[in-house]
Amino acid sequence: APVRSLNCTLRDSQQKSLVMSGPYELKALHLQGQDMEQQVVFSMSFVQGEESNDKIPVALGLKEKNLYLSCVLKDDKPTLQLESVDPKNYPKKKMEKRFVFNKIEINNKLEFESAQFPNWYISTSQAENMPVFLGGTKGGQDITDFTMQFVSS
């Protein structure tokens, strides 16, 4: 069966939107009005992995781009990157581990934990216009809570 996907945008708990910053990086900033069109639309695919009521494994692709968020070690540190893939073969039900995030719902907020690096989360900075990154702390200065807005296909 084909992998189930939905289109969505994400905003952090401070209502910052995610936009492209160069070809392989996302940044978070406040957008208003027509600028909202700049925010990236994700194709969120529901993939194979350990699942529970509040934890669902997903892959986060950029809609109509052959780019996926992936988590790899760089200089021995878990790092978030945008990785190009062959669009003929992705998304697939069994994604490589670096592409998988555990989507965790807590109090109507979403966290995205790396399946590859437990307790590391997609994060944004308090500051404006900073890169989206993989962070190893929750409840500190950095933001790990998001809301999801559905986008029609």
Partner: antibody
């Protein structure tokens, strides 16, 4: 240091199930990121990846052999077991286990291999 | 699956020679390319990972380069212990696949 050693029958009959064990030391499959793969090499030929298991029991299989393969781990014994059903003479090969950690890591340590012949 | 085409399948060289082996995946593997050495009766050894990074303990005469769909393993000055079979492998996409191997023999 890291070592891996494969064990299993040298000879199996066609249609039988092969069970191979990889016993390792120098690392733990309870450590986040760790994984072990099985890879085989028919006589005089190249290498073919079969299956991989991660510390969290996440499993990956070669699509062409998925229906015949099962990979499991016993963390307390430092072992990974591969079973392969419905063996055929074309499955005659040396079977290796190798360590591979965080995706997309390479196989950084390999066992010596165990030779399996499929014949009646 | 990503096919890995390795060339040449064998080569003859002398001690001190510079040797180059090529690996061409069937699609872009974004540098997720590894090289291994196999000697009879010995365990396979990882030489190079992520295209150009030397695994610990591997002599600096081994080097790797490339991008996209074109990768190279170079031995700058062949030593007697380097006569062996070399394999490339991609870790971009499951199923992880290997090249057919290059046997380096004494001329």
């Amino acid at each position: 240091q890291v070592t891996l050693k494969e064990s299993g029958p040298a000879l199996v009959k066609p249609t039988q199930t092969l069970t191979l064990t990889c016993t390792f030391s120098g690392f733990s499959l309870s450590t986040s990121g760790m994984g072990v793969s099985w890879i085989r090499q028919p006589p005089g030929k190249g290498l073919e990846w079969l299956a991989h298991i991660y510390w969290d029991d996440d499993k990956y299989y070669s699509p062409s052999l998925k229906s015949r393969l099962t990979i499991t781990k016993d963390t307390s014994k430092n072992q990974v077991v591969l079973t392969m059903t419905n063996m055929d003479p074309v499955d005659t090969a040396t079977y290796y286990c190798a360590r591979g950690s965080y995706d997309p890591s390479p196989f950084d340590y390999w066992g010596q291999g165990t030779t399996v012949t499929v014949s009646s | 699956d990503i096919q890995m085409t390795q060339s040449p399948s064998s080569l003859s060289a002398s001690v001190g020679d510079r040797v180059t082996i090529t690996c061409r995946p069937s699609r872009d593997i974004t540098n997720y390319l590894n090289w291994y050495q196999q000697k009879p009766g010995k365990t396979l050894k990882l030489l190079i990972y992520h295209t150009s990074r030397l695994h610990s303990g591997v002599p600096s005469r081994f080097s790797g380069s490339g991008s996209g769909t074109d990768y190279t393993l170079t031995i700058s000055s062949l030593q007697p212990e380097d006569f062996a079979t070399y394999f490339c492998q991609q870790s971009k996409s499951v199923p992880w696949t290997f090249g057919g191997g290059t046997k380096v023999e004494i001329k």
